[in-house]
């Protein structure tokens, strides 16, 4: 029917993926951006550089990584976008002055174990949660 | 001892919270930044504005909200920062050209129920996850 055709067109226009949207699959680098799409970047953090060498015994540093890149339309499958991020992207395109693009943030984080001196100079082995970025997405 | 005093000073300098850091409590507006700190902003999304009115029957729109604001040093308790975000903030201060600040992203998302026409014009009631921002944090 004409109304179901119109619904289909409207749905296609609105671009969606996952539950809320069938976002058209774009390459990892969005052509509309000089900046690359949201992804994980490698970053080694030295505890000496942070000035923590006097209380952290081991390790000397760790691969923390970080997330960076654009969350631009269309959000592809690699971007692990939430439904909210998809909606926000569409609202940003309509209203860029007031609503920002979603941001590129960690979606999976791992722990590391750290051997350190506590305030009383005791040696402690402790697991610190959410220290290493394993994956990034648009949120 | 002198070494434990040095450790204490180094620890205080490094500013931390939660597990990894005792971040000093800052006001919601960071003095080093004019931009307000990471927080939830209200946003009502009209499905008509998105061009979805022909296939979404109800609701006509919803309070989606969004996250925006700075994730600047020092990260306070309101910012729900992960350990990684705290480390990244310190690395950004040392190396702002290469490592960005953490970004302000949803930490709690809610679902909404939507009544819509599917491709075959059947009326479907479906719960869409991660549609509403309930809380924001630095990630």
């Amino acid at each position: 029917s004409a109304s179901s055709r119109r619904r289909q067109q409207s749905r296609n226009r609105s671009t969606q993926s996952q539950d809320v949207a069938r976002v058209s699959s774009a390459s990892d680098y969005n052509s509309s951006e000089l900046k690359t799409a949201c992804r994980k970047h490698e970053l080694y953090v030295s505890f000496q550089d942070l000035g923590w060498q006097d209380w952290i015994i081991a390790p000397k540093g760790y691969a923390a990584n970080y997330c960076d890149g654009e969350c631009s339309f269309p959000l592809n499958a690699h971007m692990n976008a939430t439904n909210h991020a998809i909606v926000q992207t569409l609202v940003h395109l309509m209203n860029p002055e007031y609503v920002p693009k979603p941001c590129c943030a960690p979606t999976k984080l791992n722990a590391i174990s750290v051997l350190y001196f506590d305030d009383n100079s005791n040696v402690i082995l402790k697991k610190y949660r959410n220290m290493v970025v394993r994956a990034c997405g648009c949120h | 001892s002198a070494s434990s005093r040095r450790r204490q000073q180094s620890r205080n300098r490094s500013t931390q919270s939660q597990d990894v850091a005792r971040v000093s409590s800052a006001s919601d507006y960071n003095s080093s930044e004019l931009k307000t700190a990471c927080r939830k902003h209200e946003l009502y999304v009209s499905f008509q504005d998105l061009g979805w009115q022909d296939w979404i029957i109800a609701p006509k729109g919803y309070a989606a909200n969004y996250c925006d604001g700075e994730c600047s040093f020092p990260l306070n308790a309101h910012m729900n920062a992960t350990n990684h975000a705290i480390v990244q903030t310190l690395v950004h201060l040392m190396n702002p050209e290469y490592v960005p600040k953490p970004c302000c992203a949803p930490t709690k998302l809610n679902a909404i129920s939507v009544l819509y026409f599917d491709d075959n014009s059947n009326v479907i009631l479906k719960k869409y996850r991660n549609m509403v921002v309930r809380a924001c944090g630095c990630h």
Epitope: S72, M94, P96 | H41
Partner: antibody, heavy 121, light 111 residues
Framework: QVQLVESGGGLVKPGGSLRLSCAAS????????VHWVRQAPGKGLEWVGR??????????EYAASVKGRFTISRDDSKNTLYLQMNSLKTEDTAVYYC????????????WGQGTLVTVSS | QSVLTQPPSVSGAPGQRVTISCTGS?????????VHWYQQLPGTAPKLLIY???ERPSGVPDRFSGSKSGTSASLAITGLQAEDEADYYC???????????FGGGTKLTVL
Amino acid sequence: QVQLVESGGGLVKPGGSLRLSCAASGFTFSSYVVHWVRQAPGKGLEWVGRIRLETHGYAAEYAASVKGRFTISRDDSKNTLYLQMNSLKTEDTAVYYCARVERSKSGFDNWGQGTLVTVSS
Amino acid sequence: QSVLTQPPSVSGAPGQRVTISCTGSSSNIGAGYSVHWYQQLPGTAPKLLIYGQSERPSGVPDRFSGSKSGTSASLAITGLQAEDEADYYCQSWDSSQTLVVFGGGTKLTVL
């Protein structure tokens, strides 16, 4: 009703400075992003820059042609937008408009009448 | 050189239909950003004519309509009237700089 009124235009020598004002009334000024747009005589519209809301830390962005020379500011308590123009060049000669950005689709829904800035020796 | 490209001039007789094109790129119109159209009558400030591709502010006659496809947008004016003689500008955003971009303007002459 919504009104934007620019003032402060005039004749200035190259290298000189000028400060334009835009007085807003009839709406909650602090809730709107506002821009400066200029139009050289007989030419098209050229975007100059914008200033965002307190929420955004009053962040200002500028066109490449004016960056480093022009500064946009706002005083929400006075419902006024400003454009500080330094190191003026002859090519800055134009009518300068302030414009309000509407909140749902980001179009410039209200414009001032404009103020003429002439840079000439 | 404007980021958005418009024809410098178009003309039509009263009652006719004219269209004005606005061509951008993948970093502005093609990136999905809204397109707005402004009318500038001689000696006056610009006025918002079409916003969000195709919506008319109150008071704008339905003779004016807008559309967008790919990296281009267009403004159509039907039933041309003498008072439509003006300059018309398209405007969007450019994501490579997150800045406002205008077309160079089109002078409409009603014959």
